[in-house]
């Protein structure tokens, strides 16, 4: 008996060939011996089987002695033995229809679990192997689970169902809903305008939800909600914003926030959460602000940074084109009695400058100038 594997929702063509290369009488029946279709001369006739509306043949092939049974929009319950009766012969074809579906939705939040469920006909014992877009292989029976979805899991999952040494391949597009970056850090000199951007790692037709930016300033004892907003069909509208700082928000995606000026009291870290409509859970992106200030008070030149800096970052004070006068893994450095000239305050990581602030030290009779 020939075995054919089909996919739920697809179309399958079961072949039946006569030795005579001409149009002769044929019938396709199901295992209950109920007629599905056949011919009456050059006419296609259909019996009362459940396939009635979804069964067809190719009349153009009848003259060549080929009498296929085409079943459209396959269902698991179409799995059956189909019998073609032609020239006093019976050809049997066993059709096994499988379906592979993702749990509830193919759009999942980062960190959530993906469960793929195999629908199979009774009596079958298929094995399933799936390959994720990042090349990870998972195997299983009726269900396959992947916990803690990552951004790299977005894309086409290719799953192969194996039964009776035959295989059928399913492709499922999974979208992991996440921000492009889990965390970002912005380095600014005091007084500069700050731009925070929160690009999404996915695109969907309509995006609706609501979000909020909570901020924990380094100097503050508790966190504070800086802004709340709504998202409707990719249009952003601000619901509530604090008076200090008075953030501004872009009306279109990607989510974009502007802080008019970087001040030491704003330095710290924030957490932007986005709750999407019809989704349980939220998207998160951490954002950090580091603010630098260089000042000269009497005979003391000071450079300070506020905000979440790593212990390996180096803060230096140097006269332009000279070696660093002071360089420490601390958040404040100073030079007493600095000589006149353009001084540079540098925040660097392994020699790479992250933030730079220049201050001009005038001869002792003058007041300092900040460019």
């Amino acid at each position: 008996k020939k075995v054919v594997l089909g996919k739920k929702g697809d179309t399958v063509e079961l072949t039946c060939t006569a030795s005579q290369k001409k149009s002769i009488q044929f019938h396709w029946k199901n295992s209950n011996q109920i007629k599905i279709l056949g011919n009456q001369g050059s006419f296609l006739t259909k019996g009362p089987s459940k396939l009635n509306d979804r069964a067809d043949s190719r009349r153009s092939l009848w003259d060549q002695g080929n009498f296929p049974l085409i079943i459209k929009n396959l269902k698991i319950e179409d799995s059956d033995t189909y019998i073609c009766e032609v020239e006093d012969q019976k050809e049997e074809v066993q059709l096994l229809v499988f379906g592979l579906t993702a749990n509830s939705d193919t759009h999942l939040l980062q960190g959530q679990s993906l469960t793929l469920t195999l629908e199979s006909p009774p009596g079958s014992s298929p094995s399933v192997q799936c390959r994720s877009p990042r090349g990870k292989n998972i195997q299983g029976g009726k269900t396959l689970s992947v916990s803690q979805l990552e951004l790299q899991d977005s894309g086409t999952w290719t799953c192969t169902v194996l039964q009776n040494q035959k295989k059928v391949e399913f492709k499922i597009d999974i979208v992991v809903l996440a921000f492009q970056k889990a965390s970002s850090i912005v380095y600014k000199k005091e007084g500069e305008q700050v731009e925070f951007s929160f690009p999404l790692a996915f695109t969907v037709e309509k995006l609706t939800g609501s979000g909020e930016l909570w901020w924990q300033a380094e100097r503050a004892s508790s966190s504070k909600s800086w802004i709340t907003f709504d998202l409707k069909n990719k249009e952003v509208s601000v619901k509530r914003v604090t008076q200090d700082p008075k953030l501004q928000m872009g009306k279109k995606l990607p989510l974009h926030l502007t802080l008019p000026q970087a001040l030491p009291q704003y330095a710290g870290s924030g957490n932007l959460t986005l709750a999407l409509e019809a989704k349980t859970g939220k998207l998160h992106q951490e954002v950090n602000l580091v603010v630098m200030r260089a000042t000269q008070l009497q005979k003391n030149l000071t450079c300070e940074v506020w905000g979440p800096t790593s212990p390996k970052l180096m803060l230096s004070l140097k006269l332009e084109n000279k070696e660093a006068k002071v360089s420490k893994r601390e958040k404040a450095v100073w030079v007493l009695n600095p000589e006149a000239g353009m001084w540079q305050c540098l925040l660097s990581d392994s020699g790479q400058v992250l933030l730079e602030s220049n201050i001009k030290v005038l001869p002792t009779w003058s007041t300092p100038v900040q460019p």
């Epitope: 209950n32 109920i34 007629k35 009362p48 089987s49």
Partner: antibody, heavy 120, light 107 residues
């Protein structure tokens, strides 16, 4: 066991739509085909069509342009609508279950029938 | 559509008689034929399926045979409760069609 009960108005005006409902009790409406058959007084049986929860309905070509069948699984009911009726549509209307099993296809359970008269 | 023609359209017989009704299909329907019995004011009842198989609970005096286009239905020994109208029905091809019926009356 499965029982069927037709319901609907006994009198319908010409050109209007005849609406009948068949309630299935003692079993699920899923999985089977459910059909409507009619019988004008003193005449033979005419198959109107059939419907299944998971498939498209099949209608008798002679009535296809006027017939609509639907299923309400939550109420375990299926219904028939026949539009633009004339006196020729006056008949006893039966609902029945079409059962398929090995070497078997038949209407094994019937409702008791409901008389519909088309008259102004 | 497949036309089903029944002979005779009516017949009179007595209790104990052997009665045969014939049904002819306008084209080959293999053995896809059922026989129904209908009593006045009642719904039809399936007696024979697949041309010759007796539905469960139906007395063995009822039988059917035939294949292709010609079919017969026989009651071997008429009982008083058998007087009714009998219909053949094909299910080879949709639409399902019935014969015009044979009315069996008491002589």
């Amino acid at each position: 066991q499965v029982q069927l009960q037709e319901s609907g108005p006994g009198l319908v005006k010409p050109s209007e739509t005849l609406s009948l409902t068949c309630t299935v009790s003692g079993g699920s409406i899923s999985r089977y085909y459910w059909s409507w058959i009619r019988q004008p007084a003193g005449k033979g049986l005419e198959w109107i069509g059939r419907i299944c929860t998971s498939e498209n309905p099949n209608y008798n070509p002679a009535l296809k342009s006027r017939v609509t069948m639907s299923v309400d699984t939550s109420k375990n009911q299926f219904s028939l609508k026949l539009s633009s009726v004339t006196a020729a549509d006056t008949a006893v209307y039966y609902c029945a279950r079409e059962l398929e099993r090995l070497n078997y296809y038949g209407m094994d359970v019937w409702g008791q029938g409901t008389t519909v008269t088309v008259s102004s | 559509d497949i036309q089903m023609t029944q002979f005779p359209s009516s017949l009179s017989a007595s209790v104990g008689d052997r009665v045969t009704i014939t049904c002819q299909a306008s084209q080959d329907i293999s053995n896809y034929l059922n026989w129904y019995q209908q009593k006045p004011g009642k719904a039809p009842k399936l007696l024979i399926y697949d041309a010759s198989n007796l539905e469960s609970g139906v007395p063995s005096r009822f039988s059917g045979r035939g294949s292709g286009t010609d079919f017969t239905f026989t009651i071997s020994s008429l009982q008083p409760e058998d007087f009714a109208t009998f219909y053949c029905q094909q299910y080879d091809t949709l639409p399902i069609t019935f014969g015009q019926g044979t009315r069996l009356e008491i002589k």
